[in-house]
Amino acid sequence: QGWQAFKNDATEIIPELGEYPEPPPELENNKTMNRAENGGRPPHHPFETKDVSEYSCRELHFTRYVTDGPCRSAKPVTELVCSGQCGPARLLPNAIGRGKWWRPSGPDFRCIPDRYRAQRVQLLCPGGEAPRARKVRLVASCKCKRLTRFHNQSELKDFGTEAARPQKGRKPRPRARSAKANQAELENAY
């Protein structure tokens, strides 16, 4: 009954669990026997240029419960939120609240999701309803993307979900892809 307060957008944040918690252990699964050799997807960065690689952006660790209607994940999941402006790596502060944002006088760079992974979650429901199993997409890494004059303010508002959809990853790091519905909301929170 107490769960009715949770939003139905899978963004319930629990900062008390720490700003940089360890990611939850991966669920056990037996995929080793039937894996395609070299089946991963090669990296593909259509927007990256030499100067983009010199920029860096914040990856804020987020711990939260996943919700689906009245149901909530049995355990919290940890993901990243891509935060704010990009700047030269050497000028970026190490933590929130220290230093000043560096703003380029020339082209604008934004910190956006680069890669996603999928994670299995079990959702517990109130009132004796049967538990649910879902797979959720979580941000795995962020990147700086150079904005062009074609990106207007309305596009920026929804930048995390439309303007630069992240790609799928490849081994060795488990990653998935696709724009999360509420990434822009989380970005704006910072």
Epitope: N34, G39, H44, A118, A133, R165, Q167, R175, A176, R177
Partner: antibody, heavy 121, light 110 residues
């Protein structure tokens, strides 16, 4: 909206290979998990393999391991499924299918129109 | 490899209710198999009705529902319509590898 358009029908001889293409529009291929499913005439659906976003790899069904290769050309947003050492029982309609772009991972939401591959001597 | 079993054929009267089931040779079907249900009509590609046991899609008619029943995945059709006559396939996820059932041919009499 994701749309998948597959290449046309093929007739192959036993022992040959076939490469079926699946062109994605509406989204980019790198955003999607592409899977391949086949259906022999009058028979049921059979999963051949696809991209697994949990570990970022392509996984093949045991039955096709070593005989099937699934690749992608991200510059043209086209996925390919190549099946080698063809035999008559590989005669089937081959489908590509992808997930949706959203918060929850849902596979097999969008399907190509199918490509009929006939293996005959 | 696991074998997924379905009833080969079922019949329902218009307006009636029918339940299709989907079993696994490995034992009980659970939510961790993320059961999918597909509908396929002759000459058409399949279309997804249910994902993750019970999750309907925007195009899924309300008369279809998914559940777990007696150790199997189940698709229940309440208030069958003539247009529901089709082949229905279930699909189970075995740790990233998928296996389809043999399909159930559903006939709507009338």
């Amino acid at each position: 909206e994701v749309q998948l358009v597959q290449s046309g029908a093929e007739v192959k001889k036993p022992g040959a290979s076939v490469k079926v293409s699946c062109k994605v529009s509406g989204y980019t291929l790198t955003e999607l998990s592409m899977h391949w499913v086949r259906q022999a005439p009058g028979k049921g659906l059979e999963w051949m393999g696809g991209f697994d976003p949990e570990d970022g790899e392509t996984i093949y069904a045991q039955k096709f391991q070593g005989r099937v290769t699934m690749t992608e050309d991200t510059s043209t947003d086209t996925a390919y499924m190549e099946l080698s050492s063809l035999r008559s029982e590989d005669t089937a309609v081959y489908y590509c299918a992808t997930d949706t772009v959203g918060y929850w991972e849902k596979f097999f939401q969008h399907w190509g129109q199918g490509t009929l591959v006939t293996v005959s001597s | 490899q696991a074998v997924v079993t379905q009833e080969p054929s079922l019949t329902v009267s218009p307006g009636g209710t029918v339940t299709l089931t989907c079993g696994s040779s490995t034992g009980t079907v659970t939510i961790d198999h993320y059961p999918y249900w597909f509908q396929q009509k002759p000459g058409q590609a399949p279309r997804t009705l249910i994902s993750d046991t019970d999750d309907k899609h925007s195009w899924t008619p309300a008369r279809f529902s998914g559940s777990l029943l007696g150790g199997k995945a189940a698709l229940t059709l309440s208030g069958a319509q003539p247009e529901d006559e089709a082949e229905y396939y279930c699909l189970l996820d075995y740790g990233g590898r998928f296996v389809f059932g043999g399909g159930t041919k559903l006939t709507v009499l009338g």
